[in-house]
Interface confidence: low
């Protein structure tokens, strides 16, 4: 069943944690829909993000991190492996020096990291999407 | 109640019509929600659009029209009457030369007629917002 | 996980009335927008009327005035009566849930395995 969007939960990620998220544009690519998941350090929508991610399907995707209320150096890509109408599975795990998106199972993007992982304390996915599935795995120990 | 987002009604425009919309931002400013409502010439979402107006809250609002499929001149202002988490009404009159949009009963922008109003088949409200009214009204004969 | 299965359709004469049905399993009925869509052979799904949770409905333009939808969240159902019928109205109709309130197909995540309106002139 569908997850409401905003989607907002509590998340603890260190090495080895991954994020998986489910979901599909709410409109067609031409008139560009937002898919945006940000990773905070509070459970507080206003708190500082250690990871943003933003795609602009069918443009661009941008990654920035946000530090004292301040966006930072943002990184842009123009891959785009999310297909128009499509649903989409994305990945994000995290690495020992850096974040690795998967969409659809393909390598994508990689953000290195500015703020330790263990900073998190919140993930929240929203935006133009309808939204199937949210799960953090960790690894075992 | 809340009505769903993306909203979608068909809609004749004219000289005299009004859409009103009232609604919330889903985020806090700083995020950037954005609120986006297109007067498309068809019941396709794909159709061009005689008016697109995109609010970026806290930040800017831009205009444009999408002919043929392809975007024109965008119009950008700076003017943000929009209150962070407040409530708003938005009102778009259709005026025989532009259209005049007001924002909590103040005229805040204005759009030249690129395409006749008369083109318009349906309106679509849509991004970062809870949607609690949305009418079209007629001007009596 | 909802499903759909819809119920209703037939042969009739141009001018006569169909009443289509779609039965919803699952406790969260109330909570999506409706949709009929139809497909003809060889041609995409077209929209045909959608309903919002709260009873609120928009039509195709080629139908409006001739069908209307309703839905029971009472009894998880979404009804559209079809009024007039025309030759260009034969296609598959398929009933469709989801999050949004639209006419685009990709909106609804929960699709009907449709039922057959033929209409004869």
């Known amino acids: 069943s569908l997850l409401p969007v905003p989607y907002t939960e509590a998340a603890s990620l260190s090495t080895g944690s991954t994020v998986t998220i489910k979901g599909r544009p709410l409109a067609c690519f031409l008139n560009e829909p937002y898919l945006q998941v940000d990773f905070h350090t509070e459970m507080k929508e206003e708190s500082d993000i250690v990871f943003h991610f933003q795609v602009c399907f069918g443009r661009r995707v941008v990654m920035n991190s946000r530090e004292y209320g301040a966006w930072k150096q943002q990184v842009e890509s123009k891959n785009m492996p999310f297909q128009d109408g499509q649903e989409f599975e994305l990945s994000i795990s995290v690495l020992p020096d850096k974040y690795q998106v998967m969409v659809n199972g393909q390598s994508s993007y990689t953000f290195d990291h500015r703020i330790k992982p263990e900073a998190v304390k919140m993930v929240q996915v929203w935006r133009d999407i309808s939204l199937t599935k949210f799960n953090v795995s960790y690894l075992k120990r | 109640s809340l009505l769903p987002v993306p909203y979608t009604e068909a809609a004749s425009l004219s000289t005299g019509s009004t859409v009103t919309i009232k609604g919330r931002p889903l985020a806090c400013f700083l995020n950037e929600p954005y609120l986006q409502v297109d007067f498309h010439t068809e019941m396709k979402e794909e159709s061009d659009i005689v008016f697109h107006f995109q609010v970026c809250f806290g930040r800017r609002v831009v205009m444009n029209s999408r002919e043929y499929g392809a975007w024109k001149q965008q119009v950008e202002s700076k003017n943000m009457p929009f209150q962070d988490g407040q409530e708003f009404e938005l009102s778009i009159s259709v005026l025989p030369d532009k259209y005049q949009v007001m924002v909590n009963g103040q005229s805040s922008y204005t759009f030249d007629h690129r395409i006749k109003p008369e083109a318009v088949k349906m309106v679509q409200v849509w991004r970062d917002i809870s949607l609690t009214k949305f009418n079209v009204s007629y001007l009596k004969r | 996980q909802v499903q759909l299965v819809e119920s209703g359709g037939g042969l009739v004469q141009a001018g006569g009335s169909l009443r289509l049905s779609c039965a919803a399993s699952?406790?969260?009925?109330?909570?999506?927008?409706m949709a009929w869509f139809r497909q003809a052979p060889g041609k995409e799904r077209e929209f045909v009327a959608a309903?919002?949770?709260?009873?609120?409905?928009t039509y195709a333009d080629s139908v409006k005035g001739r069908f209307t939808i309703s839905r029971d969240n009472a009894k998880n159902t979404v009804t559209l009566q079809m009024n007039s019928l025309k030759p260009e109205d034969t296609a598959a109709y398929h009933c469709?849930?989801?999050?949004?309130?639209?006419?685009?197909?990709?909106?609804?995540?929960?699709w009907g395995q449709g039922t057959q309106v033929t209409v004869s002139s």
């Open positions: 469709a849930a989801g999050g949004t309130y639209s006419f685009v197909p990709r909106s609804y995540n929960y």
């Open positions: 699952g406790r969260t009925f109330s909570t999506y927008s």
């Open positions: 309903i919002t949770r709260s009873g609120g409905n």
